[in-house]
Amino acid sequence: MNGRVDYLVTEEEINLTRGPSGLGFNIVGGTDQQYVSNDSGIYVSRIKENGAAALDGRLQEGDKILSVNGQDLKNLLHQDAVDLFRNAGYAVSLRVQHRLQVQNGPIGHRGEGDPSG
């Protein structure tokens, strides 16, 4: 029998320092570009190798960005969100939502040597 797929949603504050080529990621979403059904939020679609975000390591593709330097990203046009990042300054604080997929299988006996974590 297959297990149910659930999601564990966590929030995190990520402080990035703008690198020589910027923050180093792409975004999708906005009120005029809904990437997720019934959600006009802003999502990370790509993290550039060796960019500031990649070197920091916490921001992940698929993360939802809730705010930038305390400014809410709700109900923004796509380009307005892009411009907000571009004008965010050298030190950029991101409030992000991670959505981790959790496989809930049938409960079974944990055998010897199985991870107990």
Partner: nanobody, 127 residues
């Protein structure tokens, strides 16, 4: 995974026009940034033009002569090339990456910014 197929290349006389097309697979085409690059024999691949959700960018060598546009309903990006010159002769490649860069749009001039590439279409401009 996105697949890109270019078409529209050919042989044209200097001063003439061509329109290149790049058809993309995928349901979320509108969220992709699309670019055109070209590579002449013995030269490096060079940036030509790019279009995001709401911005366009051109290399200085084609500005005023070439126009990039997209039709999200048809999953296609176009490169209208006017006033062609012999130095425009090259293989033209379509490229794609999901999303818009949060950094200056100028980052789109580098090929490392793109994840998907077409096979290319040959454009030859004779004098």
């Amino acid at each position: 995974q996105v697949q890109l197929v270019e078409s529209g290349g050919g042989l044209v006389q200097a001063g003439g026009s061509l329109r290149l097309s790049c058809a993309a697979s995928g349901r979320t085409f509108s969220t992709y940034t699309m670019g055109w690059f070209r590579q002449a024999p013995g030269k490096e691949r060079e940036f030509v033009a790019a279009v995001t959700w709401s911005e366009t960018l051109y290399s200085d060598s084609v500005k005023g002569r070439f126009t990039i546009s997209r039709d999200n309903a048809k999953n296609t990006v176009y490169l209208q090339m006017n006033s062609l010159k012999p130095e425009d002769t090259a293989v033209y490649y379509c490229a794609a990456v999901q999303g818009s860069p949060v950094d200056t749009i100028v980052v789109l001039t580098t090929s490392e910014e793109y994840d998907y590439w077409g096979q290319g279409t040959q454009v030859t401009v004779s004098s």
